[in-house]
Interface confidence: medium
């Protein structure tokens, strides 16, 4: 038979490649069929036999075509501030995320084996850079004619409302206050928020905390013993 | 309970190479990093590399690549170190030591230790 | 690297008395508030024992007159009070990053 219409196993012709979902076995001379995601290579195929697919077992996947001799290991079950966000199946791994309000401070090729609380600038300091996945806030002291009178890992520096008779200024936590007549504002009212984070499995980049940022009081865990829950597994 | 048990003292040619393993029992292998720290006599600790046996990752000490070279066996829960081109500088206690992914991030477990001397 | 100086190198104290470790790294091992520096003890002929982890974390088991503290660079471990039990050498690690370090130890005997 042409190779176009060939069944598996068979021999290519010279100089041609195996077919999609195929592979060439070195030890067969054989194209022969990959397994499916979801499945791993049981037993490789010979000469008058194909490939011997099987489902991955519990708690290992296959994500891509393959022809693995065994499925891959789902990583580690989250750890007490991450959510899952993908669970492990038989053809995705797990993906385990910082919490909402957090992100990942320490990460290696297997995943965040940290993740912190997103700084929050005190009153006088407003977010400079928000915080993604993978860096915290960068907060930086209020301009003069802007303000922020919140501790928040959000909020921006808003400009000061505009008075006609101004009765009080405004600083660097407070908003002016006017008397009798109307303010107006050269910005729309209210606090200015920043999008939180996008969740991306990113590689980890150390975040560089500028001389004006408000003091971090994060931490990760409680002061004494791990509980179990904090680490894969208890002792 | 948490144990890592080493394989046996080793004796060996200078050239020749020497494979130690570590059984771990009592946790999910694949969950945790396997750490191998060197100490020669009356020398301090000094931390060789580690595996994630979950997906076969490694991360070595630059002064260790080429010398040390860490596997993990899943199915029998074992972590392997082969040392190559053993000298006597090679000469020390060996020790694996789980790391956990989340947490401490510290060894709080380890092995007994396995000695191997380099003569000829 | 990060290189880890233990002092003293080796130390006396009498029972029932203060000992204080004291690590100091070449560069901070903070991060996110979070110090990533632990504390063993290898008695002679036995593999080291963890006994804080993250500065000032007790491990499991280990007996309270244990302690740890410090920041950034700079890191303590005290044993109040010293007992019998305590001769060994101590050693101070990072795992802020890899290569992962170890202090030179300090050998605790007593007096």
């Known amino acids: 038979l042409p190779a176009q219409v060939a069944f598996t196993p068979y021999a290519p012709e010279p100089g041609s490649t195996c077919r999609l979902r195929e592979y060439y076995d070195q030890t067969a001379q054989m194209c022969c069929s990959k397994c499916s995601p979801g499945q791993h290579a049981k037993v490789f195929c010979t000469k008058t036999s194909d490939t011997v697919c099987d489902s991955c077992e519990d708690s290992t996947y296959t994500q891509l075509w393959n022809w693995v001799p065994e499925c891959l290991s789902c990583g580690s079950r989250c750890s007490s501030d991450q959510v899952e966000t993908q669970a492990c199946t038989r053809e995705q791994n797990r993906i385990c995320t910082c919490r909402p309000g957090w992100y990942c401070a320490l990460s290696k090729q297997e995943g965040c084996r940290l993740c912190a609380p997103l700084r929050k600038c005190r009153p006088g300091f407003g977010v400079a850079r928000p915080g993604t996945e993978t860096s915290d806030v960068v907060c930086k002291a209020c301009a003069p004619g802007t303000f922020s009178d919140t501790t928040s890992s959000t909020d921006v520096c808003r400009p000061h409302r505009i008075c006609s008779i101004l009765a009080i200024p405004g600083n660097a936590s407070t908003d002016a206050v006017c008397t009798s007549t109307s303010p107006t504002r050269s910005m729309a009212p209210g606090a200015v928020h920043l999008p939180q984070p996008v969740s991306t499995r990113s590689q980890h980049t150390q975040p560089t905390p500028e001389p004006s940022t408000a003091p971090s009081t994060s931490f990760l865990l409680p002061m004494g013993p791990s509980p179990p829950a904090e680490g894969s597994t208890g002792d | 309970q948490v144990q890592l048990q080493q394989s046996g003292a080793e004796l060996a040619r200078p050239g020749t190479s020497v494979k130690l393993s570590c059984k771990a029992s009592g946790y999910t292998f694949t969950d945790d990093y396997i750490d191998w720290v060197k100490q020669r006599t009356g020398q301090g600790l000094e931390w060789i590399g580690e595996?994630?046996?979950?997906?076969?990752?490694?991360y070595y000490n630059e002064k260790f690549k080429g010398k040390a070279t860490l596997t993990a066996d899943k199915s029998s829960s074992t972590a392997y170190m082969q040392l190559s081109s053993l000298t006597s500088e090679d000469s020390a206690v060996y020790f694996c030591?789980?790391?956990?992914?989340?947490?401490?991030?510290?060894?709080?477990?380890w092995g007994q230790g396995t000695s191997v001397t380099v003569s000829s | 690297d990060i290189v880890l100086t233990q002092s003293p190198a080796s130390l006396a104290v009498s029972l029932g008395q203060r000992a204080t470790i004291s690590c100091r790294a070449s560069?901070?091992?903070?991060?996110?508030?979070?110090?990533?520096m632990h504390w063993y003890q290898q008695i002679p002929g036995q593999p080291p024992k963890l006994l804080i982890y993250?500065?000032?974390n007790l491990e499991s088991g280990i007996p309270a007159r244990f302690s740890g503290s410090g920041a950034r660079t700079d890191f303590t471990l005290t044993i109040d009070p010293v007992g019998a039990v305590d001769v060994a050498t101590y050693y101070c690690?990072?795992?802020?990053?890899?290569?992962?370090?170890f202090g030179g130890g300090t050998k605790l005997e007593i007096e």
């Open positions: 690690q990072q795992s802020k990053e890899d290569p992962y370090t």
């Open positions: 030591a789980r790391s956990q992914v989340y947490g401490k991030i510290a060894m709080d477990h």
């Open positions: 595996i994630y046996p979950g997906s076969g990752n490694t």
């Open positions: 560069e901070s091992v903070d991060n996110s508030g979070n110090s990533f």
């Open positions: 993250r500065a000032s």
